[in-house]
Amino acid sequence: MAVTACQGLGFVVSLIGIAGIIAATCMDQWSTQDLYNNPVTAVFNYQGLWRSCVRESSGFTECRGYFTLLGLPAMLQAVRALMIVGIVLGAIGLLVSIFALKCIRIGSMEDSAKANMTLTSGIMFIVSGLCAIAGVSVFANMLVTNFWMSTANMYTGMGGMVQTVQTRYTFGAALFVGWVAGGLTLIGGVMMCIACRGLAPEETNYKAVSYHASGHSVAYKPGGFKASTGFGSNTKNKKIYDGGARTEDEVQSYPSKHDYV
């Protein structure tokens, strides 16, 4: 029962996490114009992985895609790659884990196969979560570096009294969504790996070995020994079924970063 719950919960947590990674990847607010200690402008700039946007005080928003591939910073390309790899691995992991769920019967699939699939999906979720966390962290590091560079020369003299003010960018909502989503996917993956240990059949690892003694035929089975310690409770031939994993729908609305007041 505990194994099924752990596996089901791991699946749901990973599902939420991957949905979050997809959402973060698509979001435009990876970096947003820093409003603190900055001359207040009537336009608000924010940027995503795929396009940059400008919102005027009237609410009019104009977004422009990054139509160049070679002209983009290598770091941005790396972040895109990490997020896409995370999504692809996560999606494959979800597909695998659906078939691995103990509460779903597919033909005469053995527990050992389900255990292997659960472990595979768990590893995929862990790598997916790490990719997302790494991608978001690389972008955040890039922002911090650029922030302090632009702060150092925030007011660049242009001769005489004329000045140009550099727009500084700070963390956008997508970064926090990405971090949380990556973390959830990672946790879900760990839970799947834990569930895998409970799913693994214990008796199939060692075949019975026959020892022939004179006059007697004694079959000796090693009993109190386990291949890996801590493989969970000895369930022998008991089969546990749970009536479907519960899912949670998380509806999040993202308030606009900049409220013109």
Partner: antibody, heavy 120, light 113 residues
Framework: QVQLKQSGPELVRPGASVKLSCKTS????????IHWVKQRSGQGLEWVVR????????YYNEKFTGKATLTADKSSSTAYMQLSSLKYEDSAVYFC?????????????WGQGTSVTVSS | DIVMTQSPSSLTVTAGEKVTMNCKSS????????????LTWYQQKPGQPPKLLFY???TRESGVPDRFTGSGSGTDFTLTISSVQAEDLAVYHC?????????FGGGTKLEMK
């Protein structure tokens, strides 16, 4: 068509208050910012304040904080600006205007202006 | 506050002549996010409210004759009238529409000889 109609001229004593109105029509009042701009005789324009009638959010030119108070009545699609503790230098023509959508924060429609004269 | 300086303060022209007036801001009005300059031009005829001519420095408002041209970027902007007509006699104001508080130039008065 979009119209902004302002109240008539005002002659007030120093230290008194005056409330100017700007009645709008021809568009959804709650969806656009309303600005007030001051123009002293023979001089340039000076931005005073703006209000978003949909939320009541206001943004003041610091110079006019405490001098001007903005309100908006959604039911009558009218914006109001109250000027308090009037001084001689507050004598000017006050225009209300609408900020256009997708027009680079510019004001695309203007009222005819209200003349305020502060005199003892 | 951003200081907007218009030059000349007045211009005396003859009909059909080409006219150029300038506007200089104390800080760049160019937004890096969309590469647009948040400068607006208004025309104000005597006894009337200002009328919008250009926004984003060079985008002509509908109904504005094409003899009017707005140009410039960063801190230096120009309004050009290719062939002045009698109805163009007015005061022309430039406005910073980027930084709060919004600020206007002193205006350029266009007069006929």
């Amino acid at each position: 068509q979009v119209q902004l109609k302002q109240s008539g001229p005002e002659l007030v004593r120093p230290g008194a208050s005056v409330k100017l109105s700007c009645k709008t029509s021809g568009y959804i009042f709650t969806n656009y910012w309303i600005h007030w701009v001051k123009q002293r005789s023979g001089q340039g324009l000076e931005w005073v304040v703006r209000i978003y009638p949909g939320t009541g959010n206001t943004y003041y030119n610091e110079k006019f904080t405490g001098k001007a108070t903005l309100t908006a009545d959604k039911s009558s699609s009218t914006a109001y600006m109250q000027l308090s503790s009037l001084k001689y230098e507050d004598s000017a023509v006050y225009f209300c205007s609408r900020e256009g959508y997708g027009k680079g924060n510019s004001m695309d429609y203007w009222g005819q202006g209200t003349s305020v004269t502060v005199s003892s | 506050d951003i200081v907007m300086t218009q030059s000349p303060s007045s211009l005396t022209v003859t009909a059909g002549e080409k006219v150029t007036m300038n506007c200089k801001s104390s800080q760049s009005l160019l937004n890096s996010g969309n590469q647009k300059n948040y400068l607006t031009w208004y025309q104000q005829k005597p006894g009337q409210p200002p009328k919008l001519l250009f926004y984003w420095a060079s985008t002509r408002e509908s109904g504005v004759p094409d003899r009017f041209t707005g140009s410039g970027s960063g801190t230096d902007f120009t309004l050009t009238i290719s062939s002045v007509q009698a109805e163009d006699l007015a005061v022309y104001h430039c406005q910073n529409a980027y930084y709060y508080p919004y600020t206007f130039g002193g205006g350029t008065k266009l007069e006929m000889k």
